[in-house]
Amino acid sequence: AVNGTSQFTCFYNSRANISCVWSQDGALQDTSCQVHAWPDRRRWNQTCELLPVSQASWACNLILGAPDSQKLTTVDIVTLRVLCREGVRWRVMAIQDFKPFENLRLMAPISLQVVHVETHRCNISWEISQASHYFERHLEFEARTLSPGHTWEEAPLLTLKQKQEWICLETLTPDTQYEFQVRVKPLQGEFTTWSPWSQPLAFRTKPAALGKDT
């Protein structure tokens, strides 16, 4: 395989997007590079332009179709190549036979909202975005709550081992500002990883009623 000192990592969002990151030791000259996708059993192929994300790494998104269209299945294999311009030609810099459903990373959950808030608890719901119907209920979630004076990294992780698109946070402090995030992961796929964290949802618990425990 062509690899040299480079690393080429891609994930499928389970619907119509493959996101790739390519890193190369030893900076390249100002040259244009692309990712090419050639499925083994589809009529289409797709290309995206790699754009720098740091001094030695580039990223791009292969848009395979409409966001909610199911463009690949568990039996598909996609040959992914990094091609860089040299003279008038393209040179293959990295290559992999990509099995989409072994390399899943879903989109971050969306539409986070507070369903109900009290002094010590808060019920929050969310939706998953662009997730394949193939998963049925085979998804898990992780959630975290940011308390005042703490960082996200310090926040304990709450694990939901089933497809449950809500959570009831308990033992909260009254009249306190919190932030909440959630991420999702399919149970399928050897190299599957967690989605990015959702946009944080800010909420405030209700103040304790004077002389009354809520």
């Epitope: 062509v2 040299g4 000192t5 480079s6 008038v88 990295a94």
Partner: antibody, heavy 121, light 112 residues
Framework: EVQLVQSGAEVKKPGASVKVSCKAS????????ISWVRQATGQGLEWMGE????????YYNEMFKGRVTMTRDTSISTAYMELSSLRSEDTAVYYC??????????????WGQGTTVTVSS | DVVMTQSPLSLPVTLGQPASISCRSS???????????LEWFQQRPGQSPRLLIY???NRFSGVPDRFSGSGSGTDFTLKISRVEAEDVGVYYC?????????FGGGTKVEIK
């Protein structure tokens, strides 16, 4: 069958220009690169540069920059190499050769028969 | 530019005997993708060059298996296991790893 057929021998005076043609057949002309290589009498091979007929994009060896121009006419599947300000050292056989647009394995697979250019006063 | 140096300049060989040509590059010709684009061309008398070997050791289609290539980094070798009459000509090494691509000066193989 892949074939690259080049134009006939040329005799030029110093300071003049020469334009060599290379007609391709047996494959899709716009899917491959055409490289130009020259061989001075009794000497080795020298890569001059190349053109991608698909979009007309060119790359020239620094050694020939400013003197060489590579063009193509896709309607007749023909590539051209023009060398200007000729001097006696440019007396050579000029070859065109086909190359894959994506350099996966090798630079040039099929070659033309060569065009002899003689520069003499 | 990468300078490719071949030796010997001339190689007289006996029919049926092996022959070996050396090619040395002035710098490492491993491309940043990890591949080594070292090729060998044969030019028979009065003919155009013909691709024999690519990426150090891969035979191009139609090339007899008596031709083999080896080497790495900066040192490469073309071997003919048993020389035949049709093998007479000049052999060139070529590097396609670093632009501008360059050829060796050639080795002339002739029958003793």
């Amino acid at each position: 069958e892949v074939q690259l057929v080049q134009s006939g021998a040329e005799v030029k005076k110093p300071g003049a220009s020469v334009k060599v043609s290379c007609k391709a057949s047996g494959y899709t002309f716009t899917d491959y690169v055409i490289s130009w290589v020259r061989q001075a009498t009794g000497q080795g091979l020298e890569w001059m540069g190349e053109i991608y007929p698909g979009d007309g994009n060119t790359y020239y060896n620094e050694m020939f920059k400013g003197r060489v121009t590579m063009t193509r006419d896709t309607s007749i599947s023909t590539a051209y190499m023009e060398l200007s300000s000729l001097r006696s050292e440019d007396t050579a056989v000029y070859y065109c050769a086909r190359g894959s647009y994506t350099y996966d394995n090798y630079a040039m697979d099929f070659w033309g028969q060569g065009t002899t250019v003689t520069v003499s006063s | 530019d990468v300078v490719m140096t071949q030796s010997p300049l001339s190689l007289p060989v006996t029919l049926g005997q092996p022959a070996s040509i050396s090619c040395r590059s002035s710098q490492n010709i491993v491309h940043s993708n990890g591949q080594t684009y070292l090729e060998w061309f044969q030019q028979r008398p009065g003919q155009s060059p013909r691709l024999l070997i690519y990426k150090v050791s891969n035979r191009f289609s139609g090339v007899p298996d008596r031709f083999s290539g080896s080497g790495s980094g900066t040192d490469f070798t073309l071997k003919i296991s048993r020389v035949e009459a049709e093998d007479v000509g000049v052999y060139y090494c070529f590097q396609g790893s670093h632009i501008p691509w360059t050829f060796g000066g050639g080795t002339k193989v002739e029958i003793k």
